[in-house]
Every structure is written in structure tokens, then in C-alpha cells.
Interface confidence: low
């Protein structure tokens, strides 16, 4: 993405006012729920961009005091808009995708640098995962603290999650789980996986039963990633909240120490949002504290939590880290991943509701081939001649991006990068290389998923003592 500054604060301020009017008029008229939701999301996104740029909340009666000078080159000449990231919206105007270095600065996290990767290698005695080596997990909060604890034989545990919005999971959804499995293996630590079926019930047009059934179905895909049944607890919020007083007590503690104003500022909630949405962040925060799982950790409150997640989930955990010391708990540490790009390009996060935006875990070999050939955005030239002469652009080519996620062989990947950039490899050949990686990967996943019986799911989802051997 070009190194550009966001639109001036005054422009942003005016855009919010305009968008606010639009939302009000849509609500007053006969607009569809989708139209209203989309307009509200845009409003929230603008408000959060304003807060990030101004360092304070947008207030309708308080225009920015020192607006940045506006461009005098006319509207068509303005630089690309600032990326926007929150738990529900990911927007960038760049074909390369989000500018992650800028995001680190904006979110106040730390870059996963060579030094940290080397330290992980030393601590575990294992070669760092290619997600680390390739900057797919690119940002962290307090990972050095986790390594300090680990090196001093102090325990920690992993926490990640999934919002089960539909039965169909796509390959992008696997990223945090693939990495979390590696973390579990190399550090030999317990793992809790939260299925936020309650969140999906609140945000989507689902019944409670549907939300829960999605959680169970998604759990099968997660289990198929190879998690150790003796070290992993998968739980549905709808199920576990009612049976764990430790968990619910922490939810209430968090709710007591976070104000509505704070969650409005962090998540952009509006007065028309149901109260379930407003209190939900406390439920996603609670697994960060070890005594939410008395069957695993008894009542210990001092066990550090490490959360691998996509960067869009960071607002939840910024709130969690803020509230932790106020309720006497350690702050959870975080490892952030980049977004998995949609087939159509890196400008947005994929959606499970658009079947052509991604490769689904249920896709057949033929569907994979068709989708990649037909929908994967290409960084190649318009003609073979031009491509041979000028080469392709790996920075925007989705097939190459997917290979960085799924082709483990560094040498092969580097050879493909060189060949495609030089023009020696054509777009069709690059797509073929990706298809040859994805087809067996998905087929193997489907085979493993078939072996996940209801009994296995039940065991993973039963609160119980976990087995691990902290050394």
C-alpha cells in the first residue's frame, strides 16, 4: 500500500456527519436490514478511523481544532484511504492488502522480529513455523513475557476461538488453528478453544439451536487440525457458560469494570444495538483468565494466557488487557496474524457467505481447480508476451499469497517467486502450482474430519482435567 496519510481530520469529521445522516434516513425509511447494517458498519468504521487519527472520540459538536491541510489536487488525486480494521470490518483500498507495519503503530503492538523468532526457536528447540518465518504472524503483545515464564518453568496456556457463523469453514479459518496446533506441540501446553455461538446468535439471523449446531460442526473441522484430545478443551459459550461458575464469575467481573462508554469507543456500538452485543466482549475476554477453567487450573488466577488470533480480534483483547490488572489477573499475551485474502484480491477479508470468495473445506478437487482458475486475482500481465517481458507481481497475486500460507517448502516458494517475477512462470502455471498444493491439503482435511465422531467431539467439549507435562 502506498505510504500515505489518512484523509484530513476535517474531511473525516464531515464524512461521519454525512454517514450519520444516511443511517438515520435509512432507519426512518423502508431500507432493508442489510442496507442499514452496511451503513452502520461504515459509520462505525469512520468513527474508529477518526479516533485512531485524532486520538479522541468523534463528537458531533466538536470539529477537530487543527485540521490537516487538505490536498489542492482535487478529489481524484488523493492518496489511498487509511486501512480500517475491526472485528467485523476489514477495509483497504490497496491491492497489496493491509499495511501491517502501519497497523502495528496504530494498534500499539510490537513487530515479531528476527530476534523474537530466534528466541522462540531457542526456547522450543524447534524450527520456527513458516507462519512466523514469513511474517504471517507478524505482531505480538508480551510474547517475551511468555517466553520468560516458559524458560523459568512457569506455566502458560493457549486460548483461541472461532465464531461459528455457518457450517462451511474456509481455508482462511484454519490459519489460527494450524499455528495454534504448532504452538501446542512445541510448548506442550494446554489449549482452550472458545466457540462463540452466543455472539453469532446475537449478530446474525440465527436461532440458538442453529448457532450451537454450527459450533459443533465447526468443532469437527478444528479437531481435524490434529489437536491433542488430552490437552485441548473446546467449548460452546451457550453450553459452558451455564455450567461453569468460574467462567461466569469472570464475565461478571469484567462487565463490572468496563463501562458502556469504553465498549462504544472500542467496538463502535450504537444506542440501537441490543444489550447482548454490548456485554459480549466480556465473554470473549473471560477465557484469558485461568480460573475460568477450574477443571483445568483449579482456582489459580496467575497462569499466563497466550492468544493467537487474527489482528481484527485485537480490540477485544486490548480491552481484556486493560481490565486484567483491575480485577487482579495477568494480562493475556497475543500473537496476531495477517488476513487471509479473498480469492478476488487482498482488499478485504473473506466471507463464508460468498462461495466464490474462498476455498471451502468442503470443496471438491474440481471446485478447487475451478475457483482458483476462475476467481483467483492475478498479478500477471495482460498478454503472454508482456508477462514474459515484464514478469508478474507477487505482491498482489492471490495464488502466490495462498502459496505463502500453504506451501511449506521455503526453497520451492522462493523459486516460484523468482520465476513468476521474472516472467519465466505464467499465471496459469502459478495457479496450477497452487491447485496442486490445495487439493491434497483439503482432501486430507476432509478425510481427518470424517474420522471425528460425535463421541470424539463430546470428549473435546467436556470440561475435564487436561494432560500435559510442563518441563
Amino acid at each position: 500500500m502506498p505510504n500515505s496519510e489518512p484523509a484530513s481530520l476535517l474531511e473525516l469529521f464531515n464524512s461521519i456527519a454525512t454517514q450519520g445522516e444516511l443511517v438515520r434516513s435509512l432507519k426512518a425509511g423502508n431500507a432493508s436490514k442489510d442496507e442499514i447494517d452496511s451503513a452502520v458498519k461504515m459509520l462505525v468504521s469512520l468513527k474508529m478511523s477518526y479516533k485512531a487519527a485524532a486520538g479522541e472520540d468523534y463528537k458531533a459538536d466538536c470539529p477537530p481544532g487543527n485540521p490537516a491541510p487538505t490536498s489542492n489536487h482535487g478529489p481524484d488525486a488523493t492518496e489511498a484511504e487509511e486501512d480500517f480494521v475491526d472485528p467485523w470490518t476489514v477495509q483497504t483500498s490497496s491491492a497489496k492488502g493491509i499495511d501491517y507495519d502501519k497497523l502495528i503503530v496504530r494498534f500499539g503492538s510490537s513487530k515479531i522480529d528476527k530476534e523474537l523468532i530466534n528466541r522462540i526457536e531457542r526456547a522450543t528447540g524447534q524450527r520456527p513455523h513458516h507462519f512466523l518465518r514469513r511474517g504471517i504472524f507478524f505482531s505480538h503483545r508480551d510474547m517475551n513475557q511468555v517466553l520468560d515464564a516458559y524458560e523459568n518453568k512457569k506455566p502458560f496456556y493457549l486460548y483461541t476461538g472461532r465464531g461459528p457463523s455457518s457450517e462451511a469453514m474456509h481455508v482462511g479459518h484454519l490459519i489460527p488453528f494450524i499455528f495454534t496446533k504448532w504452538l501446542q506441540d512445541v510448548f506442550n501446553v494446554p489449549l482452550v478453544i472458545q466457540m462463540t455461538d452466543d455472539e453469532k446468535y446475537l449478530w446474525k439471523d440465527l436461532t440458538l439451536d442453529q448457532a450451537y449446531s454450527y459450533a459443533v460442526e465447526n468443532a469437527k473441522d478444528i479437531i481435524a487440525c490434529g489437536f491433542d484430545i488430552n490437552k485441548t478443551f473446546i467449548f460452546s459459550d451457550l453450553d459452558y457458560m451455564g455450567m461453569s461458575s468460574g467462567f461466569y464469575k469472570n464475565v461478571v467481573k469484567i462487565q463490572k469494570h468496563v463501562t458502556f462508554n469504553q465498549v462504544k469507543g472500542i467496538f463502535g456500538f450504537t444506542d440501537s444495538d441490543c444489550i447482548g452485543k454490548i456485554s459480549f466482549p466480556a465473554i470473549q475476554a473471560a477465557p484469558s483468565f485461568s480460573n475460568s477453567f477450574p477443571q483445568i487450573f483449579r482456582d489459580r488466577t496467575d497462569i499466563q494466557c497466550l492468544i493467537p488470533c487474527a489482528i481484527d480480534q485485537d480490540p477485544y483483547f486490548r480491552m481484556t488487557r486493560d481490565v486484567a490488572p483491575r480485577i487482579g489477573y495477568p494480562k493475556p499475551a497475543l500473537l496476531h496474524s495477517t488476513f487471509f485474502p479473498a480469492l478476488q484480491g487482498a482488499q478485504t477479508k473473506m466471507s463464508a457467505s460468498d462461495p466464490n470468495s474462498s476455498i471451502f473445506l468442503t470443496d471438491t478437487a474440481k471446485q478447487i481447480k475451478t475457483k482458483v482458475n476462475k476467481h483467483a486475482f492475478s498479478g500477471g500481465r495482460d498478454t503472454i508476451e508482456e508477462h514474459r517481458q515484464f514478469g508478474g507481481n507477487c505482491d498482489v497475486d492471490v495464488s502466490f499469497m495462498y502459496l505463502t500460507f500453504f506451501l511449506e517448502d521455503d526453497d520451492k516458494l522462493e523459486q516460484i517467486r523468482k520465476d513468476y517475477t521474472s516472467g519465466a512462470m505464467l499465471t496459469g502455471e502459478l495457479k496450477k502450482a497452487l491447485i496442486e498444493v490445495l487439493q491434497p491439503l483439503i482432501a486430507e482435511h476432509q478425510a481427518r474430519r470424517k474420522e471425528v465422531t460425535d463421541e470424539i467431539v463430546k470428549e473435546f467439549m467436556t470440561p475435564r482435567k487436561l494432560s500435559f507435562d510442563f518441563q
Epitope: 506455566p155 494446554p190 488430552n230 483445568i296 487450573f297 483449579r298 482456582d299 489459580r300 475435564r464 482435567k465 487436561l466 494432560s467 500435559f468 507435562d469 510442563f470 518441563q471
Partner: antibody, heavy 121, light 110 residues
Framework: EVQLLESGGGLVQPGGSLRLSCAAS????????MSWVRQAPGKGLEWVSA????????YYADSVKGRFTISRDNSKNTLYLQMNSLRAEDTAVYYC??????????????WGQGTLVTVSS | QSVLTQPPSASGTPGQRVTISCTGS????????VYWYQQLPGTAPKLLIY???QRPSGVPDRFSGSKSGTSASLAISGLRSEDEADYYC???????????FGGGTKLTVL
Amino acid sequence: EVQLLESGGGLVQPGGSLRLSCAASGFTFSSYDMSWVRQAPGKGLEWVSAISSGGSSIYYADSVKGRFTISRDNSKNTLYLQMNSLRAEDTAVYYCARDVAWDMLGDFDYWGQGTLVTVSS
Amino acid sequence: QSVLTQPPSASGTPGQRVTISCTGSSSNIGSNYVYWYQQLPGTAPKLLIYANSQRPSGVPDRFSGSKSGTSASLAISGLRSEDEADYYCGAWDDSLSAYVFGGGTKLTVL
């Protein structure tokens, strides 16, 4: 029902050896750290040794270091205590105990009924 | 000589409240959880209090535990004859890398 059943105790001469076993049932043995705790006649409890669930972390009381070896066979659901160079002061009832805390904190929620070891000439 | 210090005996009449103390140091009670065990005559010990103050299921709420700094205490209210037993406190000791017990307190119900 959780059960821990010790065996292998008996009379042994000073300098001799004994191997105690603790057969576990009613729970997933491989998920739990285990300890041996002893009690000399008319005396208090003394922790002897602990082993983590997978067997990689082992701890001993100073009084038995270098003489006793704790081990486990998760496939047989059995905990062992190999006792060498026995002394008169090792005479005690030996209990095996399940540690429910996940990082060996001594949260002994289940105990066996004990096996008596007598070291005497 | 035990690492954790308990009074050798305590007594009370039925219905009374008695407290048993357990004193340690920064490397055991000061930095780890305290556990209390009850040993009835001729039986194996039984977990009474875990994590300083938590009761396992089945333990009556007449038993309560607390911890402050490097000391802990077990309180028994509404004393009953069946509470006559030996009581032991225990904690992990970081400097010894070992689990340590108190010497035990013999509780007599008069």
C-alpha cells in the same frame, strides 16, 4: 470411582531394596501428576517424590534423593517407587496420591490406602 | 523439624469454633497455594481445603481456609465429635523444589 491401590511393601533389611506399585483406576491416569507421601509410625506426613503426567518432570525430597526412583507406566495405569539403600528411618506407610493441580502443586485429591514398609535387621 | 509450623494440638467442645495455624516462609506459603488435609484415625489423609480457601465437593462449609502473607489457617466452626482427627497443612516450596507438610495438629473434641 477413582481408586489407588498400593502394593509391594514389606519387611526389608537395611541397605536392601523394594519396589512399590500403585495401580490406578477410575480416571485417565495419563492426565495426572502423581506423588508418593509417607508417614512413619506415630509421626506426620512427609512428601517423598512427584512425577508429572508424562514422566518428564520428577522431584524428590532431600531425604531420599539418590536412593529412590519414581516412575510411571501410563499404558498400565501404574505408578512405581523403586527404593534402594533403605534405612531404618524409611520405615513408614507409603501412600500414592493423585495431584489434581496441573503443575505439581500438591493438590492431592485422592489417596491410596497405603502400604507398610519396615526396614529392620 | 517441619518446614511448615503447626501447633501440635488443639481442642474444643462440640459446637465451638477452633482455628489451626500454619506458618511458613516466602518460598512456600508466601508464593504458593496452601492445602489442608484431614486424617481420621487409621485412615489415609483426605483433601479438606485446596488453593488456600476452596472446599472440594462433599466437604462441609463448617471448614474454611484462609491465607495471609506467609501464614495460613484452618477454621472449623460448629465442632463435631467426628472432626477429631489430625490436620496437616501443605504447600509447594520453590527453594526446595519439594512439597512440604506441617507437622500436623491433633484436634480433640472434648
